[in-house]
Interface confidence: medium
């Protein structure tokens, strides 16, 4: 009995920022849950975590250096990623687990979202660029 997740197939981050909405076939209201966003085909990098507990404030954090925020809807979590680098263009997967009330639930693997980062390169440009080659 798995939760189904829907994501946009592709998003373009024009200004190094993007909103990725994860829509679930499950109502998160009054649940203890952990929603996370993972980078790469193997989901090796946990980009951002949104932890919700019916008795506490929503916790949003990244242990991998991403600048992220999260917003909770009844059946969705939206991850807001900022300061993305062009080389962070990749496929991103939404995951969810519900710990309370029982039974423990998690999701079927989603199709993922390709985030294409087209923004500025976020690296300092030289003040005095060298002479251009003819």
């Amino acid at each position: 009995n798995k939760i189904l997740v829907k994501q946009s197939p592709m998003l373009v981050a024009y200004d190094n920022a993007v909103n990725l909405s994860c829509k679930y076939s499950y109502n998160l209201f009054s649940r203890e849950f952990r929603a996370s966003l993972h980078k790469g085909l193997d989901s090796a990098v946990e980009v951002c975590v949104v932890y919700g507990n019916y008795s506490q404030q929503l916790q949003v954090y990244s242990k991998t250096g991403f600048n992220c925020d999260g917003k909770l809807g009844n059946e969705s979590v939206t991850f807001y990623l900022q300061n993305l680098y062009v080389n962070q263009t990749d496929i991103y997967f939404c995951k969810i687990e519900v710990m309370y009330p029982p039974p423990y639930l998690d999701n079927e693997k989603s199709n993922g979202t390709i985030i294409h980062v087209k923004g500025k390169h976020l690296c300092p440009s030289p003040l005095f660029p060298g002479p251009s080659k003819p």
Epitope: R34, S36, E97, M99, Y100, P102, Y104, D106
Partner: nanobody, 118 residues
Framework: VQLVESGGGLVQPGGSLRLSCAAS????????IGWVRRAPGKEEELVAR????????RYADSVKGRFTISADTSKNTAYLQMNSLRAEDTAVYYC????????????WGQGTTVTVSS
Amino acid sequence: VQLVESGGGLVQPGGSLRLSCAASGFNIKDTCIGWVRRAPGKEEELVARICGEYGSTRYADSVKGRFTISADTSKNTAYLQMNSLRAEDTAVYYCAAQPRYYDVYDYWGQGTTVTVSS
């Protein structure tokens, strides 16, 4: 379904113990595993809990920073590392599958006794 605890014993205050909970008949990554302790004259306490494939954890305030719960899904075993033990940690520690806060559980182990005394 079976849960078998081990690792209890007598330890001096400030010492450490590591409890193990070997599960069979179900996959621990498909549920939550909790460590519950019972001591005479005290309320039963869910001291730590770990859930699912991603290993989300939660601790009772009384053990935060001292106890660490973990799981090895390849061995289908959960662990409770107990450091800086105190006399008040003396209890029978039970491993329970799918804790339903705070006092009802689906499956229980037989318990292992932890005694903290000099």
